[in-house]
């Protein structure tokens, strides 16, 4: 007979990413004996919750909790029974709930209460439902990307920790209601709100991060729609031949469009709006989202927000990825340079509704909006974050790394479960996010 080594025991963790437009559940797993290695935690499975984000249930909070049941039932199947009790379960809500909290703290509390009630009914080790700050969202996305790409440490053949310090990757996240940019920088921040110091695997990281509320994909589209409605005739970013009835209440209920709300309007009224496929006017419409004229610091991105020059390589994920992937795969256009991205955007924006539909078999609900989002992404990167051709060459658009979705969820779990030690093994334990 021969000794057969048993496979190492696996541990599991679950994170519910409660975004503004929808909720996703991620189940992670890792070998119990390698908890402190970098890149060892990976995605076991995922599930997209049907329906809107939890903030969309503000008027019926119990449905927010109910909406999660289908995915939680899947988690029961994905995680071995004997691991249920030791599997941490977290729910993190992002900008959709931050916006709801601005307008209705009571409704926000009720929604969180409802999801908590649902989550506590499951046999997992539920550790709370909370709203992440924009800074959390940015930093945890950065941690996720660099952890998965093993940029923090390497395990050497001599059994010692070898730190390559090969440089970290900046992270850009485009959600439904906010967008985040996070990158390691050598220059001290002129605004303490944008600086985070991390100690990971014995290394110190000075990280710049900022989250722009109301600059997520869906809120940008609502703001552009509100601008078009102010003029009441057409939408230059929508394709010619496309028209729809716009319910005014839906446009103006967001805090992001409050400034564009008419003094008096019939909240139940609908307005017919048509597209004109006018790339030039769409560019001007989008440029109105960025105030680059005033900066109280030595350098800014936009809206008076401090930002040092972008440095190093970046990964752009979530809606950045989906939009650029559309330009590449559906439109068949190159996007390797800023100039090409501008070209691809212009080409997309000049397409008629019939031309766009011909490229996409079957009705695609988001089809009319790709022009506006692509235009926004181009301007956000070039005018907003000030990427030039040289720095843009270091940007990759991806949704996954090492077969795991890139987003804040993994970094959030790694932090809360102390899976990233602040110091090298044998020295000190415990993650320090200061």
């Amino acid at each position: 007979t021969q000794d057969v080594r048993e496979p190492p025991a696996l541990k599991y963790g679950i994170v519910l990413d409660a975004g503004s437009s929808h909720t996703s559940m991620f189940v992670y797993k890792w070998p119990a004996d390698k908890e402190n290695d970098t890149g060892i935690v990976g995605q076991h499975s995922s599930c997209d919750v049907r329906g809107g984000g939890i903030s969309s249930y503000a008027n019926d909070p119990s449905r927010a909790g109910q909406s999660l049941v289908e995915c939680l039932e899947q988690a029961l199947r994905d995680v071995p029974k004997d691991r249920y009790a030791s599997t941490p379960l977290y729910l993190g809500a992002t900008a959709g709930m931050r916006l709801l909290n601005l307008t209705s703290p009571e409704a926000t509390a009720k929604v969180l209460e409802a999801v908590t009630q649902t989550l506590t009914r499951y046999p997992f080790d539920f550790r709370g439902a909370r709203i992440l700050s924009g800074q959390d969202e940015g930093v945890f996305g950065w941690v996720t990307a660099n952890y998965l790409l093993e940029n923090f440490i390497k395990y050497g053949w001599v059994g010692r920790w070898i730190r390559p310090r090969k440089g970290t990757l900046g992270a850009m996240d485009l959600g439904g209601a906010s967008t985040q940019i996070t990158f390691e920088t050598t220059s001290p921040s002129e605004d303490p709100d944008n600086e985070v110091h991390l100690r990971l695997y014995g290394q110190h990281y000075r990280v710049y991060t900022h989250s722009f509320l109301c600059y997520g994909r869906d809120q940008v589209l609502q703001r552009l729609l509100a601008s078009a409605l102010q003029i009441h005739r057409f939408h230059p970013c929508w394709p010619k031949g496309y028209s729809t009835q716009v319910l005014l209440r839906e446009v103006y209920q967001s805090p992001c469009t409050m400034g564009q709300r008419p003094q008096t309007f019939n909240s139940s009224a609908t307005v017919s709006l048509s597209g004109t496929s006018n790339a030039a006017l769409c560019r001007d419409l989008v440029s109105g989202l960025f105030n680059i004229s005033s900066c109280p610091f030595s350098q800014c991105s936009f809206n008076g927000v401090f930002q040092p020059p972008v440095a190093g390589n970046f990964i752009a994920f979530s809606a950045f990825y989906y939009t650029v992937d559309f330009l590449k795969t559906v439109m068949g256009l190159p996007v390797g340079t800023l100039k090409q991205l501008e070209d691809a955007t212009e080409t997309t924006c000049n397409q008629t509704w019939a031309e766009l539909q011909a490229r996409v078999p079957g009705q695609q609900t988001r089809l009319p909006d790709y022009c506006a989002v692509a235009m926004f992404i181009h301007q956000l990167l070039s005018r907003g974050y000030r990427f030039d051709e040289r720095s843009f060459r270091g940007v990759v658009f991806e949704k996954k790394a090492a077969d795991t979705a890139v987003g804040w969820a993994l970094g959030y779990m790694l932090n809360l479960t102390n899976l990233i030690p602040a110091d090298l093994p044998g020295l000190r334990k415990g993650t320090h996010f200061s």
Epitope: D284, I292, E389
Partner: antibody, heavy 120, light 109 residues
Framework: QVQLVQSGAEVKKPGSSVKVSCKAS????????VSWVRQAPGQGLEWMGR????????QYAQKFQGRVTITADESTSTAYMELSSLRSEDTAVYYC?????????????WDQGTLVTVSS | SYELTQPLSVSVALGQTARITCSGD??????VYWYQQKPGQAPVLVIY???NRPSGIPERFSGSNSGNTATLTISRAQAGDEADYYC???????????FGGGTKLTVLG
């Protein structure tokens, strides 16, 4: 075919203001932006600013910020450029130009210009 | 602020090729436009997006743009090509147009 027609030549005193008009015809005024460009005698072209009539958005060259105001009246398809605190160096031909949606926002239609002379 | 630099003048023999340059920091990253202006007339767009000709502009006019230099090339130069030529670019960062100082093209012979 879009055509632009500007107001006539002006002679102004230093310190005063001038308002030049630019009327568009033969196209939809709300489907493009209008820029103002000036050219002093024997000198090159100098961009002053632009307006997107449909949105009311304006952008100005740093050099003219605070001294130039560009407006538009959609009902008459007319753009206006007002320059205040005139000095002799402002003597120039002032052009309005359409930013073409077809040629990536470059200026494809110009008027013959308005000569503004600033002299005491 | 962003600046575009052009030679004051360029001369070319009738029927030969004229090249007018326009230099600016990393101008290859931006789109460049060329305008022709004859005495007493308004400028006319001859090249857009670095190397595209509007309808009605002869094929003899072409453009290129890379690195720090954009070039307008006029092949088989004719007497009627004698004019001032201006390059221009849109500075997206500052949301403004920038013109070069202009080049006077003289066709000899």
């Amino acid at each position: 075919q879009v055509q632009l027609v500007q107001s006539g030549a002006e002679v102004k005193k230093p310190g005063s203001s001038v308002k030049v008009s630019c009327k568009a015809s033969g196209g939809t005024f709300d489907s493009y932006a209008v820029s103002w460009v000036r050219q002093a005698p024997g000198q090159g072209l100098e961009w002053m600013g632009r307006i997107v009539p449909w949105l009311g958005h304006t952008q100005y060259a740093q050099k003219f910020q605070g001294r130039v105001t560009i407006t538009a009246d959609e009902s008459t398809s007319t753009a206006y450029m007002e320059l205040s605190s005139l000095r002799s160096e402002d003597t120039a031909v002032y052009y309005c130009a359409r930013e073409s949606p077809g040629y990536r926002y470059s200026f494809d239609v110009w008027d013959q210009g308005t000569l503004v002379t600033v002299s005491s | 602020s962003y600046e575009l630099t052009q030679p004051l003048s360029v001369s070319v023999a009738l029927g030969q090729t004229a090249r007018i340059t326009c230099s600016g920091d990393a101008i290859g990253e931006k789109y460049v436009y060329w305008y022709q202006q004859k005495p007493g007339q308004a400028p006319v767009l001859v090249i857009y997006d670095d190397n595209n000709r509007p309808s009605g502009i002869p094929e003899r006019f072409s453009g290129s743009n890379s690195g720090n230099t954009a070039t307008l090339t006029i092949s088989r130069a004719q007497a009627g090509d004698e004019a001032d030529y201006y390059c221009a670019s849109y500075d997206l960062q500052q949301a403004r147009w920038v013109f070069g100082g202009g080049t006077k093209l003289t066709v000899l012979g």
